[in-house]
């Protein structure tokens, strides 16, 4: 427990990438049943685990805030110009602020543009919405089953015609192999067979009679 | 000493296009506007363009506007007049002169010895 | 635009006079004036700005003065150096605009 402790104490070191695991290795979770690990970290430990996680992420919070804050400010400097008014009299002020006039007139008047275009947008996909939902209401959705499907049946439903071909070709290049182990299927065959004809009925009786 | 030095004039065809430059010393030159005046050979004189310490504003007369573009290279200390579709009623003596203002009142308060321009064909 | 105006477009004096060259604005330019000499050698200097303020450097004998569309300048008393043609200017409105000019000759 003093480990526990101790650990706590030292800097957080930073977690390491996780393993990416082939979906197998779950698909076997959530089939078979299997017995609940016991935890190995004791409560407090989960406490001060957790109490760490929650401190990185609101640093980590604090950090993207100030980053927007950042951005803002970063935007808001390419398109506003500190005023120069060095050396500017009155009348350079005066046609400036007819300048900036004109200006703000010709952004609001692209926001108005902008701002029509995205109402249009926004009716036409509560429309298409609309019309997903009225197809949806004719027609019953089929309750899908989960289907096991080979690879190769997979490639043909999804190819077509191409898979057949590149089957084919699959099929040319495994033939060379398939020579040299069709002698070690007929043996294993045989001894199978063996096998069979003792397992059954016929199996007792020769023993039997024997 | 405040000094500004025009070059870039010379004798063109209307439609043309030059471009002039004006050197400044002797004086902070991101800290000020500038200005370009011309004379006319009647001895008129015509404010041409303004541009403010930084580059961000430039001012313009009708009569210029569109042709003609002021621009600044503070790094360089030297101020442009970028002419275009020039017209042979562009022909003057072109005048580099540094800005001051004064309670809202501007002025040239330094200027050049002018650089001479003929548009004729 | 705003037009400047000056009464008259040449002035003869002589030296140790006092001059007087007036500048008429087409409309109310709120004491934004200025007024600039140009040598015959073409140098083009600043007298005085927002109609009474005098630029450095420059002799005292040069006064201006004036308001709302009148506006003049006074050299109190002529010297050689003087010999120039003066240039009024409005600094109220864009366009910026100068007077025709009026050329100071000796008697």
């Known amino acids: 427990m003093a480990d526990g402790s101790s650990d706590a104490a030292r800097e957080p070191r930073p977690a390491p990438a996780p393993i990416r695991r082939r979906s197998s290795n779950y698909r076997a979770y959530a089939t078979e049943p299997h017995a609940k690990k016991k935890s190995k970290i004791s409560a407090s430990r989960k406490l001060q685990l957790k109490t760490l996680l929650l401190q990185i992420a609101k640093q980590e919070l604090e950090r993207e805030a100030e980053e927007r804050r950042g951005e803002k400010g970063r935007a808001l400097s390419t398109r506003c110009q500190p005023l120069e008014l060095a050396g500017l009299g009155f009348a350079e002020l005066q046609d400036l602020c007819r300048q900036l006039h004109a200006r703000v007139d010709k952004v609001d008047e692209e926001r108005y543009d902008i701002e029509a275009k995205v109402t249009k947008n926004i009716t036409e996909i509560a429309d298409l919405t609309q019309k997903i939902f009225d197809l949806r209401g004719k027609f019953k959705r089929p309750t899908l089953r989960r289907v096991r499907i080979s690879a190769d049946a997979m490639m043909q439903a999804l190819l077509g015609a191409r898979a057949k071909e590149s089957l084919d070709l699959r099929a040319h290049l495994k033939q060379v192999k398939k020579e040299d182990t069709e002698k070690e299927n007929r043996e294993v065959g045989d001894w199978r067979k063996n096998i069979d004809a003792l397992s059954g009925m016929e199996g007792r009786k020769k023993k039997f009679e024997s | 000493e405040v000094q500004m030095v025009e070059s870039g004039g010379g004798l063109l065809k209307p439609g043309g296009s030059l471009k002039l430059s004006c050197a400044a010393s002797?004086?902070?030159?991101?800290?000020?506007?500038m200005s370009w005046v011309r004379q006319t050979p009647e001895k008129r004189l015509e404010w041409v363009a303004t541009?403010?310490?930084?580059?961000?504003?430039?001012f313009y007369p009708d009569s210029v506007k569109g042709r003609f573009t002021i621009s600044r290279d503070n790094a360089k200390n030297t101020l442009y007049l970028q002419m275009l579709s020039l017209r042979s009623e562009d022909t003057a003596m072109y005048y580099c002169?540094?800005?001051?203002?004064?309670?809202?009142?501007?002025?040239?308060?330094?200027w050049g010895q002018g650089s001479s321009v003929t548009v004729s064909s | 635009d705003i037009q400047m105006t000056q009464t008259s477009s040449s002035l003869s004096a002589s030296l140790g006079d006092r001059v007087t060259i007036s500048c008429r604005a087409s409309?109310?330019?709120?004491?934004?004036l200025n007024w600039y000499q140009q040598k015959p050698d073409g140098t083009i200097k600043l007298l005085i700005y927002?109609?009474?303020r005098l630029h450095s450097g420059v002799s005292s004998r040069f006064s201006g003065s004036g308001s709302g569309t009148d506006y003049s300048l006074t050299i109190s008393n002529l010297e050689q150096e003087d010999i120039a043609t003066y240039f009024c200017?409005?600094?109220?409105?864009?366009?910026?605009t100068f007077d025709t000019g009026t050329k100071l000759e000796l008697k």
């Open positions: 002169a540094r800005r001051d203002n004064y309670y809202g009142s501007s002025f040239m308060d330094y």
């Open positions: 002797g004086f902070t030159y991101s800290n000020y506007a």
């Open positions: 541009i403010s310490s930084g580059g961000s504003y430039s």
């Open positions: 409309q109310d330019i709120t004491n934004y």
């Open positions: 927002y109609t009474s």
């Open positions: 200017q409005q600094g109220n409105t864009i366009p910026l």
